[in-house]
């Protein structure tokens, strides 16, 4: 059994300074661990690249809204 207590924590230390088109984004996950220096969003692009972004920025919030809405639409 993996030791969850010692599981590695992913943190973001720098944020992208470029707005990413929502068409390029596939998913996101939030970094909320108190072990990380910054609250962050990690976007995964359609080519599986992970990008750290600042959740305080409006484009980041709008992108999360867009991706959330996609989860309620059945994939065909």
């Amino acid at each position: 059994q993996p030791d969850a207590i010692n599981a590695p924590v992913t943190c973001c230390y720098n944020f992208t300074n470029r707005k990413i088109s929502v068409q390029r984004l596939a998913s996101y996950r939030r970094i909320t661990s108190s072990k990380c220096p910054k609250e962050a969003v990690i976007f995964k692009t359609i080519v599986a690249k992970e990008i750290c972004a600042d959740p305080k920025q409006k484009w980041v919030q709008d992108s999360m809204d867009h991706l959330d809405k996609q989860t309620q639409t059945p994939k065909t």
Epitope: S27, Y28, R29, R30, T32, E39, V41, P55, K56, V60, Q61, D62, M64, D65, L67, D68, K69, T71, Q72
Partner: nanobody, 123 residues
């Protein structure tokens, strides 16, 4: 971490109205999808309503659609649930939740929860 505190619950007669509030403190409120859930005695917790970060999209369970309205004020770090035409079946503890992870109405995608406020609708 986000702290959520609900208020506005109480006892009301069928057909009456209540407005629930949920005040958030801690991390950036506008970066969370916000939802209301409820749990009646001996029943499972159920989704009631959600609002996107921008406030531009709302979504409701079929049981409350047309009667309840969710809104948010990002400047005040508060989300509201206006409940009209209340029915005895609406009796439950109402919980406010902040959704950090990608998703929609699934409780598992909401990371932070308030302690709940009791709403009792008498016939």
């Amino acid at each position: 971490e986000v702290q959520l505190v609900e208020s506005g619950g109480g006892l009301v007669q069928a057909g009456g109205s209540l407005r629930l509030s949920c005040a958030a403190s801690g991390r950036t409120f506008s970066s969370y999808r916000m939802g209301w859930f409820r749990q009646a005695p001996e029943k499972e917790r159920e989704f009631v309503a959600l609002i996107t970060r921008s406030g531009g999209t709302t979504f409701y369970s079929n049981s409350v659609k047309g009667r309840f309205t969710i809104s948010r004020d990002n400047a005040k770090n508060t989300v509201y649930l206006q409940m009209n035409s209340l029915e005895p079946e609406d009796t439950a503890v109402y919980y406010c939740a902040a959704g950090a992870q990608m998703g929609w109405a699934e409780a598992s995608t909401y990371d932070y929860w308030g302690q709940g406020t009791q709403v009792t609708v008498s016939s």
